[in-house]
Amino acid sequence: ARNGDRCPLGPGRCCRLHTVHASLEDLGWADWVLSPREVQVTMCIGACPSQFREANMHAQIKMNLHRLKPDTVPAPCCVPASYNPMVLIQKTDTGVSLQTYDDLLAKDCHCV
Amino acid sequence: ARNGDRCPLGPGRCCRLHTVHASLEDLGWADWVLSPREVQVTMCIGACPSQFREANMHAQIKMNLHRLKPDTVPAPCCVPASYNPMVLIQKTDTGVSLQTYDDLLAKDCHCV
């Protein structure tokens, strides 16, 4: 299957990386994270039409079965293919510490 | 966050492994696969409510932002956490061959 990057639904409608500006309060982190106070959260949003950014064989199968049984099998879903790491300054019992999270911000997206 | 396995929506409603019986024709494979003629396709289907089988920190963030901005940010999605390999007997130019696919059948599921 072609691992298509051209969206048949129109520009920006298909699975792609979006940036959402969020505060610690928005993220539910205000009680344990000190910094950064605001995060540009990158996440995967958009539709997954046939052959668009199919992650693997499973995604192809899912799309074919979705066409046959749309009430039973959902369409593939837009999710991160990889992540960017991020460091947070956190509260600890004794003060503050640095912690790296490698699964926090989406780096690129595909359909599964 | 708790990586919950108890579905608050009722039994069987949340993200879990389902088996869908499919023929080669259903899968769109009839022109290149000889065997098996039918496949028990395992896939991930179901809702992803808050804290249910959250794959990672990104899933937590996505759920929190979905609550705040449901029209902009979709809820986390039920996708495979790992796969089971499967061997297919395929047609080739010279006859038939065996080929293993490691990304074909979902083994377990989580919310991303």
Epitope: S35, P36, R37, N84, M86, L98, T100 | -
Partner: antibody
Framework: EVQLVQSGAEVKKPGESLKISCKGS????????IGWVRQMPGKGLEWMGV????????IYSPSFQGQVTISADKSISTAYLQWSSLKASDTAMYYC????????????WGQGTLVTVSS | QSVLTQPPSVSGAPGQRVTISCSGS????????VNWYQQLPGTAPKLLIY???NRPSGVPDRFSGSKSGTSASLAITGLQAEDEADYYC??????????FGGGTKLTVLG
Amino acid sequence: EVQLVQSGAEVKKPGESLKISCKGSGYSFTSYWIGWVRQMPGKGLEWMGVIDPSGSYTIYSPSFQGQVTISADKSISTAYLQWSSLKASDTAMYYCARYGRYGTYFDYWGQGTLVTVSS
Amino acid sequence: QSVLTQPPSVSGAPGQRVTISCSGSSSNIGVLYVNWYQQLPGTAPKLLIYSNDNRPSGVPDRFSGSKSGTSASLAITGLQAEDEADYYCQSWDSSSNYVFGGGTKLTVLG
């Protein structure tokens, strides 16, 4: 244009105190962390610590904890590195560097401040 | 001694391809990212590669980074005289936070 401009070279005697500075411009100073990195003569780079200028949260490398103090004055977009009692082994080039937005790398560096400690 | 291990020196002729390795462990490179910095003689370091394989704007595509397991490498193709510099890898370690390699001096021959 993002710039980090550091204070000039210093020559000090052992036991003296010192405070060197790093002034940021061309960006929102409180939106990015600032780190300090030491380079001893002919040697490699060593991370000393980090400060979030917006809340003045500081974290030090275990190797430098208690040896130096990192601070910032957001009203003048300046970060500082200071010693209360210098040693000859503090002789080095000191760089300030701005963290990229994920906090994982240093995307802009100051020109460096050479500190020489000698009796 | 650095947490990340680099060869002290590498060399190559103009136009050649050279690679610089950076070896770590499962507590740093193995689970996280690697960044690379170039330090030209007498100047401050400059970001060359971030998050394993991303180039900041302005860095020529002759420079590329990769990571496999607990090691990373920086490749420079079409070597030029102005590439002569010290190169440092940097990652994160759970005990020491930000860690650098010991640095590699690249000499362009001829």
